[in-house]
Structures are given as C-alpha cells and as structure tokens.
C-alpha cells in the first residue's frame, strides 16, 4: 500500500511514479544501502560486500553483489550501495551485443586498413581503409589470420565505435 | 498536510494519572508502516522518547518507564493516547507527539505542557 | 541503551559562518540518525535523516555527515535565524534515544 498512497514525509529519490504529486517521496521507503524489514517496520543495512541497494526502495531483499568473472579486473568492490564494477582484463573487450562475456581483442587489422583506435576493455581494435579513411564492419579476418588462420574460421568484428 | 496536536489536562496532582491525546490529520495510521510516538521534554532540557505505536497495533515502550505507560490508538477516529500512571514532579514536561514511518519523526505537534504539582 | 552524547551543551558563532555539531553514539548506529532544529518556544523540526539526507525545504547551508558511531550537523554561512537548539537521534533501535542538545548562540 506504502507504493500506493503519496509519500509525504521525506526527501526525494529516483523511482518515485511520475504521475503523482509527491512534495516528499522517500515516506514508506528505505535508503541506499538498506531494504525494508518484513514486517514493514524498519529499514535493514544491506551487508558489505554482499548486497546492495543503489536507490530508495521498498525490496524485501538487498540485491546481490556481481562476482566478477575469470577474465575480468575488479575496478571497485562491491558496497552497500553499489555494485562490484568489472572489467575485462587486458587485450580483451565487452561488446554491447555480448556482454557477458570479454572476447579477446584483434592483434591487428585487415590488409589495407590501419588501426586508428586501440584495444579498449569495452571496444575491439579500430581499423580504417588507408585511401578512404572510413571505418570497417565487415568481418574480416586480422593480419595473421590471413596467413595463418583456415577458411571459416570466424574472426571479431571490427569495432564500430568512435 | 499532515498535522499533530497534543492535548492534556494542564495540571495534575502527584500520584495521578496522566491522560493526553494526540489528534492527527492528512495520514492515516492504518497505512503499513505508519507509527506516532509521544516524547516529553522538560522545560529547558533534552527529549525523551516515551512510547510507539504501529498501524497494526503493535507498542514500544521505553525501558525506564514501561511499567507506568500505556500507549493505544483510535485509528477511525485518527487518535493516539498515552496514559502515565502514578506521575510525580519529575514528570512536569512539554510532552509531544511525532509521526514516523521508516525512519526519523519527520511531523512533530506543537506540544502540550504538563505540571505536576501538589 | 544507546547513549547519543553531544559534547558542547553551547557553541557561539558569528553571522556567516561556518560552525559544525558533533553527536557521538555509544555503539555503532548506521546510518540511522537524524538532526532536528529547536527554535525558542516551538516544537522540534527535522533538518536532517539518515545522517545526510536534507529533509523537504531545509536550505541546503544545512548538511550532515557521519556513520558508525559518529556524526556531524554543519551550517554553512550561518544566519540570525539560525539561533536555536539542535538534537541528534538514533533511531537504529529502541528505545530511541536523542543526544543532550547543541545550542546555537549568534555574536
């Protein structure tokens, strides 16, 4: 019900409806790092390290905490109010399309294309046409797969973004 | 708007009890959280927290005083009551109610003074 | 009990300063402390929650800080206004406690 009536008594926070009129939405809700008790009387401390709560909120649990995978670098740990932020390891990336999982970066770029953008923990190798100067998305395989590498074998995607 | 107001008798004799009401409008204590507490202060000195009260009838009370308080509520009439058994000078106080849900007692009435006095 | 001690009964500042008010908890609180204004003659009004949070139309020269055991209240460019007693809570678990009270006098 506490999602339902308009929350007067305290500060605002970020998932307040945005139809009603509330002069102090945070009425009824816990803060970052805390849920709210089961019986709805108390705000309850998310445990360190554990989970978390990044909003004022009305959840019964705290969210869990992201373990970073193997491949990935732990940027900063998990608190009561923020997630663990990964990122994956050197020479390796994330892309939008499969954020699950960091895929190695392309040592180097198809013949007849320069690199104009390094390996990124969230972007692949940038590559251009020499003459025209314009980005490449096909997939085309690197320089030493070229030589090396047997027909089919798939190869990333050159990076699109810039 | 929310608002609280305390009322009492004034004045009381030593070993009386002590009968105040808290009127209340713009929340009701049937909403799940919701909770008024009365808290006293002595002229010129701190607070003291009293007793609690939920929407679902369930009571806190402070240890020091337990035994001599009793806190209930009218929720259809949107009233709080506290009674203070056998009450002496020490209990000549401002006493005030407060709302709270979740958190600090964010609407405070205007408070109602109470002498003890033989 | 949690004890909630607010070492300095007094504190004298001038117009336009910057003063700040300390509240330490006998055992560790959290978060859960509010700050609470008391001017002359009136009732109590919160300023502060979940020892940060400014509550609805408290100016922002009012902030506070603090958690575990130990918290802060501090007005920045203070005003005349300004002149009034000040309370720490703990409302982590019962009973709540309030500190002794900080009062704000003007040069």
């Known amino acids: 019900e506490s999602a339902l009536i308009t929350q007067q008594d305290l500060a605002p926070q970020q998932r307040a409806a945005p139809q009603q009129k509330r002069s102090s939405p945070s009425e009824g809700l816990c803060p970052p790092g805390h849920h709210i008790s089961e019986d709805g009387r108390d705000c309850i401390s998310c445990k360190y390290g554990q989970d978390y709560s990044t909003h004022w909120n009305d959840l019964l649990f705290c969210l869990r905490c992201t373990r970073c995978d193997s491949g990935e670098v732990e940027l900063s740990p998990c608190t009561t109010t923020r997630n663990t932020v990964c990122q994956c390891e050197e020479g390796t990336f994330r892309e939008e399309d499969s954020p699950e999982m960091c895929r190695k970066c392309r040592t180097g770029c198809p013949r007849g294309m320069v690199k104009v953008g390094d390996c990124t923990p969230w972007s692949d190798i940038e590559c251009v046409h020499k003459e025209s100067g314009t980005k490449h998305s096909g997939e085309v395989p690197a320089v030493e797969e070229t030589v090396t590498s047997s027909p089919g074998t798939p190869a990333s995607p050159c990076s699109l973004s810039g | 708007q929310v608002t609280l107001k305390e009322s009492g008798p004034g004045i009381l004799q030593p070993s009386q009890t002590l009968s105040l009401t808290c009127s209340f409008s713009?929340?009701?204590?049937?909403?799940?959280?919701?909770?008024v507490s009365w808290i006293r202060q002595p002229s010129g000195k701190g607070l003291e927290w009293l007793a609690h009260?939920?929407?679902?009838?369930?009571?806190r009370y402070n240890p020091s005083l337990k035994s001599r308080l009793t806190i209930s509520k009218d929720t259809s009439r949107n009233q709080v009551f506290l009674k203070i058994t056998s009450v002496d000078t020490a209990d000549t106080a401002t006493y005030y109610c407060?709302?709270?849900?979740?958190?600090?007692?964010?609407?405070w009435g205007q408070g109602t003074l109470v002498t003890v006095s033989a | 009990d949690i004890v909630m001690t607010q070492s300095h009964k007094f504190m004298s500042t001038s117009v336009g300063d910057r003063v700040s008010i300390t509240c330490k908890a006998s055992?560790?609180?959290?978060?859960?402390v509010a700050w609470y204004q008391q001017k002359p003659g009136q009732s109590p009004k919160l300023l502060i929650y979940?020892?940060?949070t400014r509550h609805t139309g408290v100016p922002d020269r009012f902030t506070g800080s603090g958690s575990g055991t130990d918290f802060t209240l501090t007005i920045s460019n203070v005003q005349s206004e300004d002149l009034a007693d000040y309370f720490c809570?703990?409302?982590?678990?019962?009973?709540?406690?309030f500190g002794g009270g900080t009062k704000l006098e003007i040069k």
């Open positions: 407060a709302r709270r849900r979740l958190g600090p007692f964010a609407y």
């Open positions: 713009g929340f009701s204590l049937s909403t799940s959280g919701m909770g």
């Open positions: 009260i939920y929407w679902d009838d369930d009571k």
């Open positions: 055992q560790d609180v959290g978060t859960a």
């Open positions: 979940w020892a940060s």
């Open positions: 809570q703990q409302y982590s678990s019962y009973p709540y406690t």
